[in-house]
């Protein structure tokens, strides 16, 4: 949950690519005004996930989840939250 | 904002070599099955994507990272 809060559109695109869902990928890419060449590039990546099957998608999703919830990222998220709280407090 | 560790992972997936990418993945998940899968996907992407494709993927990532939705 925390990781999706940090950059929701990134995880939208990543999981659409990894799931092999072309419609979902198109919807996500529309949100960031992707050009046609950019869409083509992402579909080539998506092809690799599709060709390598469900286990491949699950394993790579596991990697992304692990990195996103690692101390490298969570430490950063906590730090950002602290900074936000400081700014909000100062703003009052 | 995207976490730098995630950004590095994606950058290496696109622009690094399979060895570099797998080494990066191993820092977080050192299971042989995970690492072999990472190598397979990375080699597949390198074979499919031209220089231009990778440029376009990188420009899209820039759009994602600077989007209000990020």
């Amino acid at each position: 949950v925390k990781m999706a809060e940090t950059c929701p559109i990134f995880y939208d695109v990543f999981f659409a690519v990894a799931n092999g869902n072309e419609l979902l990928l198109d919807l996500s890419l529309t949100k960031v005004n992707a050009t046609e060449p950019e869409r083509t590039a992402m579909k080539k990546i998506q092809d690799c996930y599709v060709e390598n099957g469900l286990i491949s998608r699950v394993l790579d999703g596991l990697v992304m989840t692990t990195i996103s919830s690692s101390k490298d990222c969570m430490g950063e998220a906590v730090q950002n939250t602290v900074e936000d709280l400081k700014l909000n407090t100062l703003g009052r | 904002e995207i976490c730098p560790a995630v950004k590095r992972d994606v950058d290496l997936f696109l622009t690094g070599t399979p060895d570099e990418y797998v080494e990066q993945v191993a820092q977080y998940k050192a299971l042989p099955v995970v690492l072999e899968n990472a190598r397979i996907l990375k080699n597949c992407v390198d074979a499919k994507m031209t220089e231009e494709d990778k440029e376009n993927a990188l420009s899209l990532l820039d759009k994602i990272y600077t989007s209000p939705l990020c």
Epitope: - | G16, T17, P18, D19, N43, C44
Partner: antibody, heavy 120, light 106 residues
Framework: EVQLVESGGGLVKPGGSLRLSCAAS????????MNWIRQAPGKGLEWISY????????YYADSVKGRFTISRDNAKNSLYLQMNSLRAEDTAVYYC?????????????WGQGTLVTVSS | EIVMTQSPDFQSVAPKEKVTITCRAS??????LHWYQQKPDQSPKLLIK???QSFSGVPSRFSGSGSGTDFTLTINSLEAEDAATYYC????????FGQGTKVEIK
Amino acid sequence: EVQLVESGGGLVKPGGSLRLSCAASGFTFSDYYMNWIRQAPGKGLEWISYISSSDDTTYYADSVKGRFTISRDNAKNSLYLQMNSLRAEDTAVYYCARDGKYNTVAGDHWGQGTLVTVSS
Amino acid sequence: EIVMTQSPDFQSVAPKEKVTITCRASQNIGSSLHWYQQKPDQSPKLLIKYASQSFSGVPSRFSGSGSGTDFTLTINSLEAEDAATYYCLQSYTLRTFGQGTKVEIK
């Protein structure tokens, strides 16, 4: 036009050291991964080492690991190979080769090579 | 370490004939296989990248195929200038060359 020019080869005694250089021109050197590959007289090609574009990752073949060091200076458009504890079997023509941008292919352009002879 | 085995080691072929060189990997390398041509006293030149993609400026008589462990380089109608040694290279993990195949014109 992409150009890679190796230099620094020569005759050296076993156990000695040598530093090879590769001067690159005709492309943005700092964008590309670079390799050293060698070829013993009358033999096949042997990959030795590669270095990432930003100089933060290096890899070596087992035959040279711990003896050879690859490095680069992006400001000088130069690639280097420091060779220590040289052996007779290191005698070869040494080539530097460029990878495609973003690792789109291994060894798309090669230099003309420089000969290293290890002999007493 | 991935071992690359080329066959044959040597081939003597008449002009206009078809040449087939094979390269076998000791494990699955997907399509991370590249082919090079080296003429006597010259540095190698890239012919085919990622098993089947022609490199720019390479004559159309050169083609590559295969994936996994078995790969083929084909020269469709041999010309005198094709006399050279041909090498395969895997980039799936680190890099390893095949031992080379020398092609001579009959």
